[in-house]
């Protein structure tokens, strides 16, 4: 029996700008029941205050409320693991809201296999912004990739669309059926999880010229 | 005809900033993003980043992020870039480009250049 | 960033000369690739994108190849009009970086 390892915050992420969570990885116990408390300041304040809710995001996590959610502000985040044989204490973390969003992927997504004047077959996709995006005010601004693959293939291929909310594919084989996906940025912040899957078969009776 | 016209020459002193502007004609503003690349005097392109005019997203070199700032006029179909706090070394040709409307990074049509020089 | 490395940096060549210009990427970047020529005081011209498609008006005699990481320009039969420098650039994701130029001169 001993006391805690030295707990370690994992990551803090905001879907939003308007909360946010943050994770924890637990050192060893020591082989005793322990705790853990997340206390966090706030950069410039003399204040220190504890994890204001450690249920809405699972174990081992701290979810802030738009309540607790100050943008423009750092905040110093720490974590306390305590035993009967002592206490430790993880670094500190800094933590701007602004850098840390992870929004949801993008939503509506559409696929059309449409033809040029040439005959030249493509598949026309698109896509609308995650929900919560207020894109028109500037709140935010998206980058976007798509990614497909046609069935049989093991690697997708990815394209970088910009800010861009719509793309054509080129190249593709009739009679195959190809898998899709979205995902999109923030200026700041960290690439979404790769959105639902769509799927759509290039019909044969296309015809493709290079 | 597609065509993009850029703003005449300036001579800026250090730590002064420029604005050089680039009117797009021939084509619908909105659906291309508009990139700008510099040219140092005998040395190679350099991209500094872009604006989509439909929702003014940008994209910046992370090396002139913290100086320079990428706008448009859809009124007008003009785009602008601002670059502060200049040196001697951001003496160069300033281009603007249109990308080709689905590949975000190729760039089509080119404006003339505008030769911004920095000297005390 | 991706680097982009053209060689060779500067080639003589006549007209007529079948010539080639390489570019490698320092990493995939799939067929994200352009091809652009410049001509002094002049602004750069697109001439192929996607590492082989010919931008609009581009003469047949040029032509890309290559994807992932190692990319060619060739020009079948040089003209008077080709002697210029010639840069790379990926468009695959921001930042787009170019290479350092090919300067093609008259032997």
């Known amino acids: 029996q001993s006391p805690p390892g030295k707990p370690e915050i994992h990551k803090c992420r905001s879907p939003d700008k308007e909360t946010f969570t943050c994770w924890w990885n637990p050192g060893s116990d020591g082989g005793l029941p322990t705790n853990y408390s997340l206390t966090y300041s706030k950069e410039g304040e003399k204040n220190t205050y504890e994890c204001p809710d450690y249920k809405t995001s699972g174990p081992n996590s701290c979810f802030f409320s738009k309540q607790y959610t100050s943008i423009w502000k750092i905040y110093i985040i720490t974590v306390n693991a305590t035993n009967e044989m002592g206490s430790s204490t993880s670094d500190p973390l800094y933590v701007d809201v602004t850098y840390i969003v992870e929004p949801e992927p993008p939503r509506n997504l559409t696929l059309e296999v449409k033809q040029l004047k040439d005959k030249k077959t493509y598949l026309w996709v698109k896509w609308l912004p995650p929900t919560i995006t207020d894109v028109k005010t500037g709140w935010f601004t998206m980058e976007y990739e798509i990614r497909l693959k046609s069935e049989e293939a093991d690697e997708w291929e990815i394209h970088f669309t910009g800010h861009q909310t719509q793309f054509k594919v080129f190249d593709l084989y009739p009679g195959q059926k190809y898998l899709v996906q979205t995902r999109c940025k923030p200026d700041h912040g960290y690439w979404s999880r790769w959105g639902q899957e769509k799927s759509i078969e290039i019909p044969n009776d296309f015809t493709l010229k290079d | 005809e597609v065509q993009l016209v850029q703003s005449g020459a300036e001579v800026k002193k250090p730590g002064a900033s420029v604005k050089v502007s680039c009117k797009a004609s021939?084509?619908?503003?909105?659906?291309?993003?508009i990139h700008w690349v510099r040219q140092a005097p005998g040395q190679g392109l350099e991209w500094m980043g872009y604006?989509?005019?439909?929702?003014?997203?940008?994209g910046y070199n992370q090396k002139f992020k913290s100086r320079v700032t990428m706008t448009t006029d859809t009124s007008t179909s003009t785009a602008y870039m601002e670059l502060r706090s200049l040196r001697s070394d951001d003496t160069a040709v300033y281009y603007c480009?249109?990308?080709?409307?689905?590949?975000?990074?190729?760039?089509?049509?080119w404006g003339q250049g505008t030769t911004v020089t920095v000297s005390s | 960033d991706i680097q982009m490395t053209q060689s060779p940096s500067s080639l003589s060549a006549s007209v007529g000369d079948r010539v080639t210009i390489t570019c490698r990427a320092s990493?995939?970047?799939?067929?994200?690739l352009a091809w652009y020529q410049q001509k002094p005081g002049k602004a750069p011209k697109l001439l192929v994108y996607?590492?082989?498609t010919l931008a609009e008006g581009v003469p047949s005699r040029f032509s890309g190849s290559g994807s992932g990481t190692d990319f060619t320009l060739t020009i079948s039969s040089l003209q008077p009009e080709d002697f210029a420098t010639y840069y790379c650039?990926?468009?695959?994701?921001?930042?787009?970086?170019f290479g350092q130029g090919t300067k093609l001169e008259i032997k």
């Open positions: 021939g084509y619908t503003f909105t659906d291309y993003n």
């Open positions: 990493e995939n970047i799939y067929s994200y």
């Open positions: 480009a249109r990308g080709d409307g689905n590949y975000v990074g190729d760039m089509d049509y």
């Open positions: 996607n590492a082989k």
């Open positions: 650039q990926h468009h695959y994701a921001t930042p787009f970086t």
């Open positions: 604006i989509y005019p439909n929702n003014d997203g940008t």
